[in-house]
């Protein structure tokens, strides 16, 4: 349960983080479980140790096995175990399935491949990214930040991505790579000028007083994936965040897709205790995507409580 | 900058569940633990429970204990706080408080409304 | 469970009076493995969220003006604020930040004359 498997290559960095967590001031002591060896803090050696992190600056195959970590808080010592693989390097191109993280999946509109573990170090942009072994070159491909984007996706885009970076520690400079598979969904989508569904335009919504009500705004912006899509509520022109009311707050629905493809969204907008005052706020349910804004105006008015007195 | 930021207020009956959602940016979420913290109207703050965000080891406190479930997703560097068989003294802002050495950084609080 | 009890639970006070505001546990929140008091101090303005001031029982939190301080060890803890300012009308909240659960104190209600 404390566990985590972590794997790296000989001659590169590789930092390992502690299942364990705790505050910043806690002490955290790492040993290597086989010889219950104290793992050094002091940063000259190559393997030590640096609160929640383990770092093998560079990294050898006999540092494999297992480590422990004790994150020691006042009440208790919280034990955590780092599971490490440090594999030769391959003198091929093709990855071994025991160094892939986790598979990630894209299509034409989200494409973004982010580096596997980068957090953990003290990196500088830009990264390097290659697809079987070949340096990604083109106006398609962007490294931006910790990840790659690919513009217009298509089915070859499919395969097994490496990221390569520098790791500082100390004025030294290591190299990591990290690799992982691609895939990508078929979607033939398209997007259209926002359809607002609900609220209709000019809708008057009867309320009580003193009660709850909820406004739903609801529009579709086209089929399969959207880039960007959004709906929201706005009070007098004003977003709800800044608007400053805390009974009256906006959840994000289901995303839908309806069975004949389309990609909608819901807006809900929450007025707690319905107050007198809110009769008088104009609540604009806004769609926007790339093709531009679309806008319903609501209004409340007072539904008188039937009267059931005979 | 960091930022935590909650779901909406919700209005539920008696009995039922209410699950609010914390989305964290501004910094690496498995780095650090998350805590729930609520208050009734007028009352103290009270902790709920925290969540190891790296393992998803959950920790509750006395007063929750098989009635609130806390979970992460790490992938949309998001914890939750689901707390069931809800009753009207569960009327409560619920927080969510990134774990250090005391919370500076919170979400903005979202209103749990427990009435029949 | 830590009990965390303040006092006074209200006071009023003018500008630029040194308001004074102190936390008693009910077992000692200091750690020998590091010699750290693990007590921190909230503010809460009205419907607002709590923003921490003190860490550490005497560690100021970046960003909060240094006229808010705090001391203490074990078991005792003050949060001092040396001159009132009309924007520190607001609850003031103890923690403990030892043990699970981390508990709260009640709270000390702060009006301006």
């Known amino acids: 349960k404390f566990s985590k498997q972590s794997w790296g290559l000989e001659n590169e960095a590789l930092i390992v983080r502690c299942p364990r967590q705790g505050k910043p001031s806690y002490t955290v002591d790492w040993y290597y479980s086989q010889t219950n060896k104290s793992i050094p803090t002091q940063e000259r050696n190559r393997v030590f140790a640096s609160g929640q992190l383990l770092k093998f600056l560079p990294a050898a195959v006999a540092d494999s096995g297992i480590y422990t970590c004790i994150v020691r808080s006042p009440t208790f010592n919280r034990t955590g175990y780092a599971n490490v693989t440090i594999y030769k390097k391959q003198s091929d191109c093709n990855v071994p399935d025991y160094l892939m993280y986790s598979t990630v999946s894209g299509s034409e509109k989200n494409s973004k491949i982010y580096c596997p573990t980068i957090d953990l170090y003290n990196w500088t942009a830009p990264l390097e990214w290659f697809k079987n072994c070949q340096a990604l070159q083109g106006s398609r491909y962007r490294a931006h930040k910790s990840f790659l984007v690919i513009d217009n996706v298509m089915t070859e885009d499919a395969g097994d991505y490496t990221c390569k970076f520098i790791h500082n520690e100390n004025g030294a400079n290591y190299s990591v790579t990290a690799t992982r598979s691609f895939t990508v969904k078929d979607e033939q989508g398209f997007s259209l000028f926002p359809v607002i569904g609900a609220p209709a335009q000019n809708e008057i919504k009867e309320v009580e007083i003193g009660k709850n009500a909820n406004l739903t705004c609801s529009a579709c912006f086209g089929k399969g994936t959207q880039f960007l899509a959004a709906v929201l509520w706005q009070l007098n022109g004003t977003k709800i965040t800044d608007f400053g009311e805390p009974r009256i707050q906006q959840e994000e629905g289901q995303n839908q897709s309806f069975s004949n493809g389309l990609a909608c969204l819901d807006m809900v907008l929450r007025i707690a205790d319905v107050k007198e005052e809110d009769l008088l706020l104009q609540y604009d349910c806004l769609a926007l995507n790339l093709h531009g804004l679309r806008r319903h105006t609501v209004r409340l008015s007072r539904k008188n409580p039937i009267d059931h007195h005979s | 900058q960091v930022q935590l930021v909650q779901s909406g207020a919700e209005v539920k009956k008696p009995g039922a569940s209410v699950k609010v959602s914390c989305k964290a940016s501004?910094?690496?979420?498995?780095?650090?633990?998350m805590n729930w913290v609520r208050q009734a109207p007028g009352q103290r703050l009270e902790w709920m429970g925290w969540i190891n965000t790296y393992i998803g080891e959950p920790t509750y406190g006395d007063n929750f204990k098989g009635r609130v479930t806390i979970t992460r997703d790490t992938s949309a560097s998001t914890a939750y706080m689901e707390l069931s068989s809800l009753r009207s003294e569960d009327t409560a802002v619920y927080y969510c408080?990134?774990?250090?050495?005391?919370?500076?950084?919170w979400g903005q609080g979202t209103l749990v409304t427990v009435s029949s | 469970d830590i009990q965390m009890t303040q006092s006074p639970s209200s006071l009023s006070a003018s500008v630029g009076d040194r308001v004074t505001i102190t936390c008693k546990s009910s077992?000692?929140?200091?750690?020998?493995?590091?010699?750290?008091?693990?007590l921190a101090w909230y503010q809460q303005k009205p419907g607002k969220v709590p923003k921490l001031l003190i860490y550490g029982a005497s560690t100021r939190e970046s960003g909060v003006p240094s006229r808010f301080s705090g001391s203490g060890s074990g078991t005792d803890f003050t949060l001092t604020i040396s001159s009132l300012q009309p924007e520190d009308l607001a609850t003031y909240y103890c923690?403990?930040?030892?043990?699970?659960?981390?508990?709260f104190g009640g709270g000390t209600k702060v009006e301006i004359k």
């Open positions: 077992q000692s929140l200091l750690y020998s493995g590091n010699q750290n008091n693990y």
């Open positions: 501004g910094y690496t979420f498995i780095n650090y633990g």
């Open positions: 408080a990134r774990e250090g050495d005391g919370f500076a950084y």
């Open positions: 923690q403990n930040d030892h043990s699970y659960p981390y508990t």
